[in-house]
């Protein structure tokens, strides 16, 4: 069909044609001119705007020997892979003398099978949990109607009758595939097939069942896992960072977590080899044949204090008259808590045992009753925490002090002369 009128003085003897096709099409638009004298540069316009970076070539053919003879000029604009942005009205423009000439227009249009702007993506979802899938397609030609398919079965009676850009799935109990068909006047395009993998739901109600200094027993309630039974659950424990630790839902902690697997059921696990009196964070995830659930939030827990695991070390006891000097060092064995102090017990062969709470000092001077003639006096020391006493040391006999033997620097503690003893708080 005619497109405008060739201007009387127009040098154009050929105008751009029409290109209509599907995306990716390659085509060429041409302008042909016959001019007298020096040939002009041909510019290309799209929708009236000069194309600065056009992929164009210009060929000039002289029709005579003389400079002033006619020339044929052919400018070719190549469209390498047709896109929506290429569509529009194309014209050639030349400047000849003081005049501007524009060719008749040609049109580039996009028309073909629907083109997907968005396709459903593979994803994992928890069993029985709602989610949405997206699909978007365009022509031209419009309209484009979508038809969703689940496991290759259409979810509507006809294209355009069911959900369009977004498909709401109320929940799945088995791994399924979803795709979408885009229909227009030119035909049908099918999207990629997205696999939606059904994983177990996140476990709930992670809690402590019992606590011991080096062990915690925890339990949880499993989430739904669709048609796939749970194979095991994985529990992670990590040392909290000075009690500041990980807030619920924060990223993974920096330290390598202690990981344990639990056969299920029961949904319970004893976590051993922990540090006493230590804050931890724990979380759990459960796994089916389809993969693991998401982790629960980190739950802060703490092991209780234990009693020291060994007696104080290097106990020495010397006697000088009615005084006895006793000193010792902190147990080498784990304290399993915060050391609150030491208890000391001494006893003669025929006298009752005397118990003392020394506090955190590691030496004591005892004022012995009477003239110091008590025979076979022995001393025992134990460390204690809030959880109780650690083991007592073996009895250390009181040695007689020899001149020249160094005496410990200490604060003299004078014990009451009465044999009565006030038992400590424990």
């Amino acid at each position: 069909a005619p497109r405008g009128t060739q201007a009387e003085e127009s040098p154009f003897v050929g105008n751009p044609g029409n290109i209509t096709g599907a995306r990716g099409l390659t085509g060429t638009l041409r302008c042909q001119l016959q001019v007298q004298g020096e040939p002009p540069e041909v510019h290309w316009l799209r929708d009236g705007q000069i194309l600065e970076l056009a992929d164009s070539t210009q060929t000039q053919v002289p029709l005579g020997e003389d400079e002033q003879d006619d020339w044929i000029v052919v400018s070719q604009l190549r469209i390498t892979s047709l896109q929506l942005s290429d569509t529009g009205q194309y014209q050639c423009l030349v400047f000849l003398g003081h005049q501007t000439f524009v060719s008749q227009p040609g049109y580039v249009g996009l028309e073909g099978l629907p083109y997907f702007l968005e396709e459903p993506e593979d994803r994992t979802v928890a069993a029985n949990t709602p989610f949405n899938l997206s699909c978007q397609a365009q022509g031209p030609p419009e309209p484009v109607d979508l038809l969703w398919l689940q496991d290759a079965v259409p979810l509507a009676t006809a294209p355009g009758h069911g959900p369009q850009r977004s498909l709401h799935v109320p929940g799945l109990n088995k791994t399924s595939s979803f795709s979408c068909e885009a229909h227009n006047a030119k035909g049908v395009t099918t999207s990629r097939t997205a696999t939606i993998t059904v994983l177990p739901q996140q476990p709930r109600n992670l809690h402590l069942v019992s606590r011991q200094p080096t062990e915690l027993e925890v339990a949880w309630t499993p989430g739904l896992s669709g048609i796939y039974p749970l194979t095991h659950c994985t529990l992670q424990a990590v040392l909290s960072d000075d009690g500041m630790g990980i807030q619920a839902g924060e990223p993974d902690p920096p330290e390598e977590p202690l990981t344990s697997q639990a056969s299920v059921p029961p949904h319970q696990l004893r976590l051993g080899s922990l540090h006493p009196h230590t804050p931890y964070h724990i979380r759990v995830a459960c796994t089916s044949s389809q993969g693991p659930s998401s982790w629960t939030h980190w739950l802060p827990v703490e092991t209780p204090e234990g009693v020291p695991l060994g007696p104080p070390e290097n106990i020495s006891a010397t006697r000088n008259g009615s005084q006895a000097f006793v000193h010792w060092q902190e147990p080498r064995a784990p304290l399993q808590g915060t050391l609150l102090g030491y208890r000391l017990a001494y006893q003669g062969q025929d006298t009752p045992e005397v118990l003392m709470d020394i506090g955190l000092r590691q030496e004591v001077t005892l004022e012995l009753q009477g003239d110091g003639s008590v025979s076979n006096l022995t001393v025992c020391v134990a460390a204690y925490t809030a959880a109780g006493d650690g083991p007592w040391s073996l009895p250390v006999p009181l040695e007689a002090w020899r001149p020249g033997q160094a005496q410990p620097v200490h604060q003299l503690v004078k014990e009451p002369s009465t044999p009565a003893f006030s038992w400590p708080w424990w």
């Epitope: 005619p2 497109r3 060739q6 050929g14 105008n15 751009p16 053919v61």
Partner: antibody, heavy 120, light 107 residues
């Protein structure tokens, strides 16, 4: 429907003249360049003349230059080819043809032709 | 002037065959080549222009190709109604010139 109808052909003596016409219909005549092409008895095709849509530009091959004149009347949708000094080489079937929009020198529609015989 | 040479005056073919008619220009014509079909008693009909652009209504069994000086018209599966005279033409510049024609006939 594009329609081109030539007329005015006939028998003419060498050195004589003849005027051919071409009546166009079915398209916007003033928007198209037109050409005359002839076909010799040996079936060879020869281009004879070209005229731009407004009639301001005409081109001829050397074989007819100075002897043939191509003109158009856009108001009447008619082309004219005035031929003089005819010789036996001009004996042919003469077709008027419309130039395509994409190249005026390629011809998308042709008339049925009018026969010109130059003979004594 | 640009000379267009169709080396085969005649080409024999059978219905259903693929046939290629060639045309050579005496200089580069920048793909400005048209192909015409003419049946006995009829005027020429445009098939192809700009070497490969199919004219409206032309069956897609007709395809044009080529560049520079060498051009080809291919009929992918010859039909009985395709038996005719085929001309090439350069539409680059005046004087416009045609090939001598190739007659496609039955074997």
């Amino acid at each position: 429907e594009v329609k081109l109808v030539e007329s005015g052909g006939g028998l003419v003596q060498p050195g004589g003249s003849l005027n051919l016409s071409c009546a166009a219909s079915g398209f916007t005549f003033s928007s198209y360049s037109m050409s005359w092409v002839r076909q010799t008895p040996e079936k060879r095709l020869e281009w004879v003349a070209f005229i731009s849509n407004g009639g301001g530009r005409t081109y001829y091959p050397d074989t007819v230059k100075g002897r043939f004149t191509f003109s158009r009347d856009n108001a009447r949708n008619t082309l004219y080819l005035q031929m003089s000094s005819l010789n036996s080489e001009d004996t042919a079937m003469y077709f008027c043809a419309r130039g395509t929009t994409e190249s005026y020198y390629a011809m998308d529609y042709w008339g049925q032709g009018t026969s010109v015989t130059v003979s004594s | 002037d640009i000379v267009m040479t169709q080396s085969h005056k005649f080409m024999s073919t059978s219905v259903g065959d693929r046939v290629s008619i060639t045309c050579k220009a005496s200089q580069d014509v920048i793909t400005a080549v048209a192909w015409y079909q003419q049946k006995p008693g009829q005027s020429p009909k445009l098939l192809i222009y700009w070497a490969s652009t199919r004219h409206t209504g032309v069956p897609d069994r007709f395809t044009g190709s080529g560049s520079g000086t060498d051009y080809t018209l291919t009929i992918s599966s010859v039909q009985a109604e395709d038996l005719a005279l085929y001309f090439c033409q350069q539409h680059l510049s005046t004087p416009l010139t045609f090939g001598a024609g190739t007659k496609l006939e039955l074997k």
